[in-house]
């Protein structure tokens, strides 16, 4: 999301609203561990990582704690005491907001309701996903709360069906992330399944000799 | 729809201070999500940001500047304000307010004042 | 600060043709640039955002692409009252800067 001409790439995830994830592929450092220094507010003094993520031995990210009246992260990356990048951030752009907790149906004729615990913050969507083995693609319905109802079911076909929260766009710009789907859930005639049968795929036409 | 009117603007010493005012009509300055802006425009045309106040009265403001200004606002008049200080020949613009898009501070601008020209000089 | 570069600084295009302008961003941004439009003696009007959404009221021969680093406004058809200065705007990074404008001018 956010990279430099400088033989760095950086990537900005901020989960939930609670910890900001930095990361670098520092192609032109291979074999050096470079430091990350943050600070939330430009009259403080930066302050040094001290949640490091390695790969291969070698320092490529950082994990920061942040909180809800932090916006604005002022970070630089630097090799020995040199800054290779330095830049300002509103953090906000880069939220990924936590997967669906608490998930529960409820099932009534053909419809089902799909409900979790709301997020602590607003902005956001509530998308579930559902499919029939008869259907090749998920399809998508979401609301601006956890309480999602999807209509027309056939009861008699099973359905699988996860959940993920998504940042609006309106409030957070279209560079966010969603969050990681629930597990898929299988429904049948109201009861829970383990699985229902893979989704079928159109037969491939036989070619003529 | 929202209207901007900046006022204010004039002749100032080097040195001296200036407090311009911006009167928003149509639109609440409180309605939660949106942030207010003052941008600045020199004469060669550059734009600056300077800094935000939002619907819950919290401030950005541009490092270059922070020292020398101050955005508040007075909800029963709909009315924002810039206070700034120590006035130099560079600081010649002519000053906007402006409104953020839906989605607070770190976007676009879709509003805008006609400007109001400060020129500094003795 | 991110350092918007907007290029060229004025172009000359006839009416009726296509204006393609540059705008070039230090860092990357995403897809968090805005355009704007400034005819004499007026305050700047947003015309896009968000690198190539569209604004409510701004005809459709305005156009954005890009993302990262690159952005591109498109003139499909250039219009009498098209002819203005055009500036970029970056909102991921703090300040928020803008580009120094490309002047478009009738050939």
């Known amino acids: 999301q956010v990279a430099t001409g400088e033989g760095l790439q950086i990537q900005i995830m901020y989960f939930n609203l609670e910890t900001v994830q930095v990361t670098w592929n520092a192609s032109h450092y291979p074999r050096s561990n470079l430091s990350f220094h943050y600070k939330f507010s430009r009259d403080e003094a930066y302050d040094q990582c001290t949640v490091y993520i390695l790969q291969e031995g070698h320092t490529s990210g950082c994990l920061l704690d942040a909180e809800q009246q932090d916006d604005i992260l002022y970070f630089s990356i630097r090799n020995g005491t040199h800054p290779v990048f330095t830049a300002s951030r509103w953090i906000f752009y880069y939220l990924k907001p936590s997967s669906p907790k608490q998930v529960s149906f409820s099932w009534h004729q053909d419809a089902v309701t799909l409900t979790c615990s709301d997020l602590s913050y607003r902005g956001l969507l509530y998308e579930v996903q559902y499919r029939s083995p008869f259907d090749t693609e998920w399809q998508s319905k979401q609301e601006n709360t956890c309480n999602v109802t999807v209509e027309d079911l056939d009861a008699e076909k099973c359905y699988a069906f996860r959940a993920r929260v998504k940042a609006m766009e309106d409030a957070y710009g279209p560079d966010t992330y969603p969050s990681d789907w629930s597990e898929v859930t299988c429904w049948q005639r109201g009861e829970t399944r383990d699985s229902c049968p893979e989704p079928r795929t159109p037969p491939k036409p036989k070619l003529s000799k | 729809q929202v209207q901007l009117v900046e006022s204010g603007g004039g002749l100032v010493k080097p040195g001296g201070s200036l407090r311009l005012s911006c009167a928003a009509s149509?639109?609440?300055?409180?309605?939660?999500?949106?942030?207010w802006t003052w941008i600045r425009q020199f004469p060669g045309k550059g734009l600056e940001w300077m800094g935000y106040?939002?619907?819950?009265?919290?401030?950005y403001y541009n490092p270059a500047l922070k020292s020398r200004i101050t955005i508040s606002r007075d909800n029963a008049k709909n009315s924002l304000y810039l206070q700034m200080n120590s006035l130099r020949a560079e600081d010649t613009a002519v000053y906007y307010c402006a409104r953020s898009l839906y989605g607070g501070y770190k976007d676009a601008f879709d509003s805008w004042g006609q400007g109001t020209l400060v020129t500094v000089s003795s | 600060e991110i350092v918007m570069t907007q290029s060229p600084a004025t172009l000359s295009v006839s009416p009726g043709e296509r204006a393609t302008l540059s705008c070039r961003a230090s860092?990357?941004?995403?897809?968090?640039l805005h355009w704007y439009q400034q005819k004499p003696g007026q305050a700047p009007r947003l015309l896009i955002k968000?690198?190539?959404r569209s604004i409510t009221g701004i005809p459709a021969r305005f156009s954005g692409s890009g993302s990262g680093t690159e952005f591109t406004l498109t003139i499909s058809s250039l219009q009498s009252e098209d002819f203005a200065v055009y500036y970029c705007q970056q909102s991921p990074g703090f300040p928020p800067t803008f580009g120094q404008g490309t002047k478009l001018e009738i050939k």
């Open positions: 860092q990357s941004i995403g897809t968090s």
């Open positions: 149509g639109f609440s300055i409180t309605t939660s999500g949106y942030y």
């Open positions: 968000f690198a190539s």
């Open positions: 106040i939002g619907y819950n009265s919290k401030t």
